[in-house]
């Protein structure tokens, strides 16, 4: 956030940039959390995303019995590996075709034992507050489907009647990693020393990191005709003075008519 300064007062402004702001010759360049001519104001909302999508990765092992292991399979640039990868990917795309979150597979290692395939199943879903549940459900369906196919597609009388055949007992789920996204934590971190006063509120399933000085949310502080300003002790209302009234009180809701005060003073004089 930047505020431009024109005229003779600018040199003075340069040395007065606050809160880590830097002078660029024309204006104070403010760090993310601040704005204003001197970076003296604290922002009332912080952009915390969310990411458009959340990913999960399942580390799986299956044993393919319809391909004979050779040392060439360890070399990822060999024709053996490339052809195996093509067929394995095609097979897995068929296995997981009913899972909307399924993105693909990535072979990490092939080793002896017919062919033991260490691979990742990649899942992705659009961000919603329920993303954990969505991905948890998807990982369960992956487990069911891979268990089913490795039980059904097996060699019978040394013949494989499918694209690939498997050893039923060679199927294992090693690890499941879901990209962590915690808007509350992100909000607290990005608000730094003001973290106690910033909260996450949702609108259209999107999280907003806001302080009570941001209008239009359930936590918003109503300063009436005053201005909400964030300080290290929390949000405060800075009350205004108009031509006719002084305003005071925690939410600037107490107005005193100047004429009454002046009249009162005049009466005393």
């Amino acid at each position: 956030r930047t505020t431009t300064c024109f005229g003779d007062g600018c040199q003075n402004t340069a040395s007065r940039c606050k809160n880590g702001g830097t002078w660029d010759g024309l204006k104070c360049q403010c760090p993310n959390l601040y704005y204003g001519e001197l970076c003296e104001e604290v922002v009332s909302s912080i952009d915390i995303g969310p990411p458009e999508t959340i990913s999960a990765q399942m580390e799986l092992t299956v044993t393919v019995t319809s391909v004979k292991f050779t040392e060439e399979l360890k070399n990822h640039s060999s024709q053996e590996f490339q052809e195996f990868k093509q067929t394995f990917t095609e097979q897995m795309n068929i296995v997981y075709s009913g899972i909307p979150e399924y993105v693909g597979v990535n072979i990490t290692k092939l080793r002896l034992g017919s062919v033991v395939v260490e691979h990742d199943v990649l899942l992705r879903t659009k961000y919603t507050p329920e993303y954990k549940t969505v991905l948890d459900n998807a990982t369960e369906v992956v487990k069911e489907k891979i268990t089913k196919v490795t039980t059904q597609q097996i060699m019978i009388n040394d013949i494989c009647s499918d694209m690939m055949c498997f050893n039923t007992t060679g199927t294992q789920v090693q690890n499941i990693t879901v990209t962590q996204y915690d808007p509350e934590e992100d909000c607290r971190k990005m608000a730094k020393e003001y973290g106690d006063y910033f909260v996450v509120e949702y609108r259209d399933q999107k999280p907003y990191c806001i302080s009570p000085c941001e209008p239009g949310f359930s936590v918003s502080k109503n300063c009436n005709l005053g201005k909400c300003q964030m300080s290290l002790s929390g949000p405060q209302c800075l009350c205004v003075t108009t031509e006719t009234h002084w305003y005071s009180g925690e939410t600037c809701n107490q107005g005193t008519q100047k004429s009454l005060v002046y009249g009162h003073h005049h009466h005393h004089h």
Epitope: T65, S66, V67, T70, E80, F84, T87, C160, M163, C165
Partner: nanobody
Framework: EVQLVESGGGLVQPGRSLRLSCAAS???????MGWFRQAPGKEREGVAG???????GYADSVKGRFTISRDNAKNSLYLQMNSLRAEDTALYYC???????????????????RGQGTMVTVSS
């Protein structure tokens, strides 16, 4: 990448014979090889398959009439077709599996490379 080119197709009378050949551009030694066919308006169908060590498999409709063979030294595959019938009319494709495929049979699941095909028409 393996390139496969079929030859030997043509018009033949019922009961006669035909020999199809398939020339491969690369080494086919460690591959299952096979033939499948597609008749006009019908689904693709596995005809015959042969493993790298010469074990063969056939579709029920061609058993006893067709013979698949391979010549690894020449990188070639053959299909000897005897006692041809009108229902054998189709486009015949040669196919190759991934390297080191085991447990082959005549169906086409295991094949990742295939040729353009050669037309066989059985008609009197």
């Amino acid at each position: 990448e393996v390139q496969l080119v079929e030859s030997g197709g043509g018009l033949v009378q019922p009961g006669r014979s035909l020999r199809l050949s398939c020339a491969a551009s690369g080494d086919i030694t460690r591959r299952c090889m096979g033939w499948f066919r597609q008749a006009p308006g019908k689904e693709r169908e596995g005809v015959a398959g042969i493993s790298e060590d010469g074990i063969t498999g056939y579709a029920d409709s061609v058993k006893g009439r067709f013979t698949i063979s391979r010549d690894n030294a020449k990188n070639s595959l053959y299909l000897q077709m005897n006692s041809l019938r009108a229902e054998d009319t189709a486009l015949y494709y040669c196919a190759a599996s991934i390297l080191n495929r085991v447990g082959c049979r005549q169906l086409s699941y295991e094949y990742i490379y295939r040729g353009q095909g050669t037309m066989v028409t059985v008609s009197s």
